[in-house]
């Protein structure tokens, strides 16, 4: 679609006669008739296929046509058409005398011509207008004339239909050849594209609008390459989306398992140091003076029995004094002045002499223990039982109450994870220091081999037009989620062109 | 036990500003992404803001944008919401919730109320 | 914006029964929904995740199902503690947005 443009400039008539010689009277005034046609080789009469304009009456005799409109009339002179421009024309132009004010062809007497020229030739679609001047023996017209497109218009032949737009459906101006031309911010071949925000991650990101950084289900961050843990975690991180990696000092599932409760809590009293001894336990281990669970509780230093053979222990302000039967002496009345001969060895325990007889070492039967066989053993002294276990004498023997989550008989072994049967889909389960590990079978991953996994449909690229893959997992089926302007099980068919485009 | 409880609400003249806080307990704060979540009297919900965990990118309704300001304080366990130019249309219960905008909201406070009214 | 659409918007059933809540997406949210029920005067509670993942804690008589555009939330036995508001929340596309909710009272 353009449009045939038509400047008249001058017409001189000098001596106001007609084609026939004729003189008009008083004076020729004067209008024209333009008609536009397909290229002729000889311009004959016939129709005018692309279009003709008539004038009103612009001047008398010889005169200048004013640019724009001159009674009423536009100047330059518009011949419309609505197909390609073929590059070639005829144009045959008329001057005619208006004796009165019915300008219709059918109203004027057939020698009221002025003047007819035809000319013919090629004319290209552009802004430049091409200066013509055509002489007879009694007038002369000069004229310019060009061809241009119609708005929305481009190209050589002005076939190429380009509006431009900044909507749903595009975002863009049109140049001159009549390709579009992206406005900032926007791509693709209709500019629906738009450009997210520099480093924008190409998989886990998205923008609806230009420099925005959306993050897909499971990211986020400004660039979107950050991922979220799991729903339910507690105190963990992740390195992929959902997953839960338990901070130090936390395990299970969701890291909601205590396993440094001593950091976490500070259980221990009294300056005692606190041992992590498992899940949500531990053990405080007290300083002098002090005993419970906690250490919370302040006794007397003579309580733990400090006197050694059978010394007597005086509580002191700054600490206790033993008194050490004949034969001791020491701090904690340690050291021995008796010999083999004194028969220091009691309840059956054997004498033995060291260093030339200046000294001595018993040598204990079953069930006692002491530098002199004086003491009942407690099978509990040397804190047999392990992971926080609860060591309870039994008459000759001993027995371990163990914590939760261990078993054994020194509570030296976990109770297993596993037990639960927690691994889905038939993984295998094997038990960790601090948890569990599932090993998952083919088309199963996760934690707990709770997802199912499968070929992955997406990895052929089967989805056309900038599309996003998404792999189903139940059907091991491939989905695309097209862009604007795309349908079809792959996006393959464009959509929503205006329907007077021509391709 | 996750737990998270709000405080600074109160009735405010359209306008107005008022600053809403979140004190959160029971899980590693610095990890998980934040939101605000709102509920006019006798409506449904209504996302208000999210925060990143990772590097505070935050997040807006239209409606609220340029007159809401989210932001937290790790070290403090706390998310806060400031609000300002108050309209009688940001009258509601306001939730802090754990998630971003595009994860559910796994965890919830028990609601601070916002009367914005003259 | 995409719009979710809950049905019905309120109903009535005994204990024991079995009751089905929809929610319609207004495009493809892939299975990125969640249900949250909330009860008078409290904060709204996750149900469950990515369409048909039990939040911890969540009875199992809680269950969803759908994909695309059409999800289902059902209760499989209504104990007298489900009487609630129910909500279906969408977080594929941004911003998130909220069903109108479905109230579940008791006949």
């Known amino acids: 679609s353009g449009v045939f443009q038509l400047q008249l400039q001058e017409f001189i008539n000098e001596r106001g006669v007609l084609a026939s010689g004729r003189p008009c009277e008083p004076g020729c005034r004067t209008f024209f008739r333009v008609c536009l046609k397909h290229f002729q080789a000889v311009v004959s009469p016939g129709p005018c296929t692309f279009g003709t304009v008539s004038t009103p009456v612009l001047g008398t005799n010889s005169f200048a046509v004013r640019d724009d409109s001159s009674g009423g009339g536009r100047n330059p002179l518009q011949l419309p058409f609505n197909f390609t421009w073929p590059g070639t024309f005829s144009l045959i132009i008329e001057a005619w005398h208006a004796p009165g004010d019915d300008l219709r062809p059918e109203a004027l007497p057939p020698d009221a011509l002025i003047s007819k020229i035809a000319i013919q030739g090629s004319l290209a679609v552009g802004q430049n207008w091409l200066l013509d001047e055509q002489t007879s023996t009694l007038t002369r017209l000069r004229y310019s004339y060009r061809v241009i497109c119609s708005d929305n218009y481009y190209g050589d032949n002005c076939s190429r239909l380009c509006k431009k737009r900044n909507d749903h459906f595009g975002h863009y101006v049109c140049q001159p050849d009549g390709n579009l031309s992206c406005l900032p911010g926007w791509t693709g071949e209709y500019c629906q594209q738009p450009i997210c925000l520099s480093g924008c991650h190409e998989q886990n990101g998205y923008c609806s609008k230009p420099a925005e950084c959306l993050c897909r289900p499971g990211w986020q961050g400004r660039l979107c390459n950050e991922c979220i843990p799991h729903n339910g975690c507690r105190h963990g991180t992740c390195s992929t989306p959902w997953q839960c990696t338990c901070d130090e000092g936390w395990g299970g599932l969701f890291c909601d398992q205590d396993l440094n409760y001593c950091t976490h809590h500070s259980p221990c009293k009294n300056g005692a140091t606190c041992s992590n001894s498992g899940q949500r336990s531990y053990t405080c281990t007290c300083r002098p003076g002090y005993t419970g669970v906690d250490c919370e509780l302040e006794l007397s230093e003579c309580d733990s029995n400090p006197c050694r053979n059978g010394g007597s222990c005086k509580d002191q302000e700054d600490g206790y004094h033993c008194l050490c039967p004949p034969g001791y002496y020491g701090l904690h009345c340690e050291h021995s002045t008796l010999s083999c001969a004194d028969s220091p060895c009691f309840n059956g325990g054997s004498c033995r002499e060291r260093n030339q007889g200046a000294n001595y070492a018993c040598e204990c039967p079953p069930n006692f223990t002491g530098s002199n066989c004086e003491k009942k053993v407690d099978r509990c002294t040397s804190n047999p039982c392990a992971n926080g276990g609860q060591c309870l004498n039994r008459g000759p023997s001993r027995m371990c109450r163990c914590r939760p989550g261990f078993t054994g008989t020194y509570c030296e072994l976990h109770v297993s994870d596993c037990a639960r049967n927690p691994c889905a889909h038939g993984g295998t389960c094997h038990d960790l220091e601090n948890g569990l590990m599932c090993t998952c079978p083919a088309g199963f991953s996760g934690r707990r081999c709770e997802v199912r996994t499968s070929i992955d449909a997406c990895a052929s690229s089967p989805c056309f037009n900038r599309a996003t893959c998404y792999t189903d997992l139940s059907t091991d089926t491939f989905v695309c989620n097209c862009p604007y302007g795309f349908v079809g099980s792959r996006c393959e068919f464009p959509v929503g062109l205006p329907p007077s485009f021509p391709w | 036990e996750v737990q998270l409880v709000e405080s600074g609400g109160g009735l405010v003249q359209p306008g107005g500003s008022l600053r809403l806080s979140c004190a959160a307990s029971g899980f590693t704060f610095s990890n998980f992404p934040m939101a605000w979540v709102r509920q006019a009297p006798g409506k449904g919900l209504e996302w208000v803001a999210t925060?990143?965990?990772?590097?505070?990118?935050?997040y807006y309704r239209d409606s609220v944008k340029g007159r809401f300001t989210i932001s937290r304080d790790n070290a403090k366990n706390s998310l806060y919401l400031q609000m300002n130019s108050l309209r009688a249309e940001d009258t509601a219960v306001y939730y802090c919730?754990?998630?971003?905008?595009?994860?559910?909201?796994?965890?919830w406070g028990q609601g601070t109320l916002v009367t914005v009214s003259s | 914006d995409i719009q979710m659409t809950q049905s019905p918007s309120s109903l009535s059933a005994s204990v024991g029964d079995r009751v089905t809540i929809t929610c319609r997406a207004s495009e493809d949210i892939y299975s990125n929904l969640a249900w949250y029920q909330q009860k008078p005067g409290k904060a709204p509670k996750l149900l469950i995740y990515d369409t048909n993942n039990l939040a911890d804690g969540v009875p199992s008589r809680f269950s969803g199902s759908g994909s695309g555009t059409d999800f289902t939330l059902t209760i499989s036995s209504l104990q007298p503690e489900d009487f609630a508001t129910y909500y279906c929340q969408q977080y594929n596309n941004y911003p998130p947005t909220f069903g109108q909710g479905t109230k579940l009272e008791i006949k």
């Open positions: 925060i990143s965990s990772s590097d505070g990118t935050t």
């Open positions: 919730s754990r998630g971003y905008y595009n994860s559910p909201f796994a965890y």
